[in-house]
């Protein structure tokens, strides 16, 4: 499919936080497309020159992934068709904190949204009954 003459699509992200050493989720949703092969998902991080993750034609395309994310990223491939572009980030590092962009291309158009991702040693709040 060609890029020219397309409309913009709505892409929505939610700021989130990740616990160092654990797995985290960077949330992103978009207006779904009926054909998986027409969907491209790119995750980018400000200040990082390689990609965080790319998913296109129904599979991961990681040749241009930045080495700092090697082996640590995945999308929920079975949920892309319904508009879920969220990224699973394994073994969260302090250096993973920053501004991420979720960039989507479909046959309907393209769009993007930024999210702030914080990292740290967060503990679950105790609830006293």
């Amino acid at each position: 499919f060609g890029i020219s003459g397309r409309h913009s699509i709505t892409v929505t992200t939610v700021a989130s936080a990740g616990n160092i050493g654990e797995d985290g989720i960077l949330s992103c949703t978009f207006e779904p497309d009926i054909k998986l092969s027409d969907i491209v998902i790119q995750w980018l991080k400000e200040g990082v020159l390689g990609l965080v993750h790319e998913f296109k034609e129904g599979k991961d395309e990681l040749s241009e992934q930045d080495e700092m994310f090697r082996g640590r990223t995945a999308v929920f491939a079975d949920q892309v068709i319904v508009g879920n572009a969220s990224l699973r980030l394994k073994n969260v590092q302090l250096t993973d904190a920053g501004t991420y962009k979720c960039y989507i291309i479909t046959s309907k158009g393209k769009g993007n949204a930024n999210l702030e991702y914080k990292t740290g040693a967060f503990s679950m709040p105790e609830v006293n009954v």
């Epitope: 040749s63 992934q65 080495e67």
Partner: antibody
């Protein structure tokens, strides 16, 4: 077209420092990393490190840590590689190369000769 | 550091021959392997990236492999192909190179 042009050959004495430049043109300078690779006479290729032209952040080969410094000047789209405390085994052709996960193109190379 | 073991270190071949060069990584590097060609007195030139993707080179060059074992093949050697070839891993820094394979005229 994308081009990397390096500074000219240098002859240095042991213990001295050398600074090699690499001027980029034909692309957005801050869009890709710049790497340095060296090749001693008749030998293979040795990865020296890289610089992120956007942030100035660097990653160096462990064996050169403390002796190598990579910097950049975004106003002139130029990166620099400085190697200090030179020894005879640093005699090599030094290349800059652009990339993320593969190097293309490469500079023409700068011969640095270390000799007393 | 990841070691890249390239073989053979040199080979003699004739124009028209099929030439195969192999590279073995010391750990799994997926398909993060590149191949370069270098001629005497010149800078290396990218041939293949991501193990099998041709850069701006003739189709007689091909690359294959994933994990730890990789191959560069020249299906029909041409006079301009006599050079030294290097593999490189780009899985993690330092992006180490193989020792090189010099392809000489028989």
């Amino acid at each position: 077209q994308v081009q990397l042009v390096q500074s000219g050959a240098e002859v240095k004495k042991p213990g001295a420092s050398v600074k090699v430049s690499c001027k980029a043109s034909g692309y957005t300078f801050t869009a890709q990393y710049m790497y340095w690779v060296r090749q001693a006479p008749g030998q293979g290729l040795e990865w020296m490190g890289r610089i992120n032209p956007t942030s100035g952040n660097t990653v160096y080969a462990q064996k050169l840590q403390g002796r190598v410094t990579m910097t950049r000047d975004t106003s002139t789209s130029t990166v620099y590689m400085e190697l200090s405390s030179l020894r005879s085994e640093d005699t090599a052709v030094y290349y800059c190369a652009r990339g993320i996960n593969w190097f293309d193109p490469w500079g023409q190379g700068t011969l640095v000769t270390v000799s007393s | 550091d990841i070691q890249m073991t390239q073989s053979p270190s040199s080979l003699s071949a004739s124009v028209g021959d099929r030439v195969t060069i192999t590279c073995r990584a010391s750990q799994n590097i997926d398909t993060y392997v590149n191949w370069y060609q270098q001629k005497p007195g010149k800078a290396p030139k990218l041939l293949i990236y991501a193990a099998s993707r041709l850069h701006t080179v003739p189709s007689r060059f091909s690359g294959s492999g994933s994990g730890t074992d990789f191959t560069l093949t020249i299906s029909s050697l041409q006079p301009e192909d006599f050079a030294t070839y290097y593999c490189q891993q780009s899985y993690t820094s330092p992006f180490t190179f193989g020792g090189g394979t010099k392809v000489e005229i028989k």
